[in-house]
Interface confidence: low
């Protein structure tokens, strides 16, 4: 189809080479009140057809996306040629950053409902470039966490180094829907609920003497509980002695509760104390046996093929640790009598 009648929008994606990030394009087809754009010719009120294109329907989910090859070849259907680009309703998701994403993307309705729809399309010229070292070193991340129940904020990564006063007007979207009230480079959330989780997009306009571009960034927001202030506690073993039968196999379980931490590096291990010697035991991998929003219970077992006299003289120590501190619980084996 002829794309000369498509409206044009220029977008800039400056990606950080330090982190994974995604990008989206919205198919910003004209709203019903702007529907003259969708006509091949301007119509006088008497000529307006019974069904104006898009009139009365805000559901523009049934759209087709194409990429325009730079060499002038025919338009390519995005779904067939680009596995790292995914279409969902009227949004195009770029899953991996890279300058090779630069180019012209065209969207139009999949169903042409009348001859007046022909020119109803949008051409988006996307320029993708890596962030230069000169850019702000401490720009906001493309993955941001909000603490449930507290006050929080979502920062636009491409503007996070600017003060609110300097910042241009920002357009925010959440999960593809326009957040019409938000215009600053930061969304302040008075009280965080789990529904604040989602994909946020922030746009602002950057102009030079020649043209103007929409600078866009995508932020994945996750709602979490606060980092624990406690070291892990050992739930099992509780007793420091354990009655055993000599010559029989034995499994001692160590279960520990670790509070939530954003950066979670739990340690749970067994070691043996034998008079002056102390060594870590190679035991089966630890496994998570219960996970909630607030904490996680991790278990690790020590397995003795058969209990010997020597084991009765040893201490079996479970050691657990998180970023706050560590806890230990030792177990002494005692021969069962009778």
């Amino acid at each position: 189809f002829n794309i000369s009648g498509c409206s044009t929008k220029k977008l800039l994606w400056t990606y950080s080479t330090r982190s994974e990030e995604e990008f989206v394009l919205f198919c910003d087809l004209p709203e019903p009140q702007k529907s003259h754009f969708c006509h091949r010719n301007r119509l006088s009120p008497k000529q307006v057809p019974e069904h104006l294109p898009f009139m009365g329907s805000n559901d523009l989910s049934d759209v087709q996306w194409y990429q325009q090859p730079s060499n002038g070849d025919p338009l390519e259907d995005i779904r067939k040629s680009y596995p790292h680009i995914i279409q969902d309703k009227c949004t195009l998701h770029f899953l991996t950053p890279g300058v090779n994403n630069s180019g012209s993307y065209i969207c139009r309705p999949k169903m042409i409902k009348s001859p007046y729809d022909v020119a109803c399309c949008v051409k988006m010229i996307l320029e993708v470039k890596p962030q230069t070292n000169a850019s702000c070193e401490y720009s906001a991340s493309h993955k941001q966490d909000l603490l449930l129940g507290s006050t929080g904020s979502i920062s636009c990564p491409s503007l996070s180094c600017q003060s609110d006063a300097q910042s241009p007007a920002v357009t925010w979207y959440k999960n593809g829907k326009l957040l019409s009230v938000e215009r600053s480079n930061r969304i302040v959330v008075d009280e965080v609920y789990d529904y604040h989780q989602g994909t946020y997009v922030c746009d602002y306009t950057q102009s030079d003497t020649v043209s103007s571009w929409t600078v866009r960034a995508v932020v994945q927001v996750r709602t979490i509980v606060g980092d624990t202030k406690l070291k892990p506690d050992i739930l099992d073993p509780v007793e420091d002695t354990l009655e055993v039968e000599l010559g029989k196999p034995l499994t001692i379980s160590c279960k520990a509760r670790f509070g939530f931490e954003r950066v979670f590096n739990p340690v749970i291990k067994w070691y043996i104390k034998d008079s002056d010697l102390e060594w870590e035991v190679s035991v089966p991998e630890a496994k998570s046996i219960k996970s909630t929003l607030k904490d996680e219970i991790i278990e690790r077992n020590i397995i003795l093929e058969k209990v010997t006299q020597r084991d009765l003289r040893r201490k079996f120590v479970c050691f657990v640790q998180n970023s706050i501190g560590n806890t230990t619980q030792s177990v002494q084996l005692k021969e069962k009598r009778g």
Partner: antibody
Framework: SVEESGGRLVTPGTPLTLTCTVS????????MSWVRQAPGKGLEWIGI?????DTYYTSWAKGRFSISKTSTTVDLKVASPTTEDTATYFC???????????????WGPGTLVTVSS | DVVMTQTPASASAAVGGAVTIKCRAS??????LAWYQQKPGQPPKLLIY???SLASGVPSRFKGSGSGTEFTLTISDLECDDAATYYC????????????FGGGTAVVVK
């Protein structure tokens, strides 16, 4: 959206991988689960992979099934299918909902696996 | 693993009437229970979560109640479109209990 693929007729013991392809949301935020339904029978939970790639399985599925993911797909590997594994396999997004619970909010249409010699 | 037992296996009522489906958990799962509706050839659809909270877009004719081990789904003012199989699911987040479904209840609307 969520869509399963890979369902086919296999002979017992032939390893099988089902793939769930998602679009419109990020697997780094949501938990995804696999559920199956034998012809004319009820729903059976297999397991779940969280946003952080932790996996949890129902007891009968441990060792027989394994769930893994990439940025846009969630795989279910059936190590050694038996005729009892004949079923429609569903992939579902399990959202964290108000009240601290999880539930299957977005489901794929399912993919049929037939295990027969 | 927790076991979810649903009763009855099937139920029928006239249009405008009501049906009650019960679900029992083999151990205390607090309010961590969801209800789904499934029609032939379709995936399940979430109706209720947290035992009594209505999922988005679900009519208020569907009502969930209960906690601990006993749960109930009541469908009032039955419509023909309510003919389906209904499942309860334990959503307690624990490696040994998460996910178990009830056996299902087929609802026939006369």
């Amino acid at each position: 959206s969520v869509e399963e693929s890979g369902g086919r007729l296999v002979t017992p013991g032939t390893p099988l991988t089902l793939t769930c392809t998602v679009s419109g949301f990020s697997l780094s935020v949501y938990a995804m689960s696999w559920v199956r339904q034998a012809p004319g029978k009820g729903l059976e939970w297999i397991g779940i992979i969280t946003w952080s790639a932790d996996t949890y399985y129902t007891s009968w599925a441990k060792g027989r099934f394994s769930i893994s993911k990439t940025s846009t797909t969630v795989d279910l590997k059936v190590a050694s299918p038996t005729t009892e594994d004949t079923a429609t396999y569903f992939c579902a997004r399990f959202d964290y909902l108000v009240g601290g619970t999880w539930a299957g909010v977005l489901w794929g249409p399912g993919t049929l696996v037939t295990v027969s010699s | 693993d927790v076991v979810m037992t649903q009763t009855p296996a099937s139920a029928s009522a006239a249009v405008g009437g009501a049906v009650t489906i019960k679900c029992r958990a083999s151990e205390d799962i607090e309010s961590y229970l969801a209800w789904y509706q499934q029609k032939p050839g379709q995936p399940p659809k979430l109706l209720i979560y947290s035992a009594s909270s209505l999922a988005s877009g679900v009519p208020s004719r569907f009502k969930g109640s209960g906690s601990g081990t006993e749960f109930t789904l009541t469908i009032s003012d039955l419509e023909c479109d309510d003919a389906a199989t209904y499942y309860c699911q334990c959503t307690y987040w624990d490696s040994s209990t998460v996910g178990a479904f009830g056996g299902g209840t087929a609802v026939v609307v006369k």
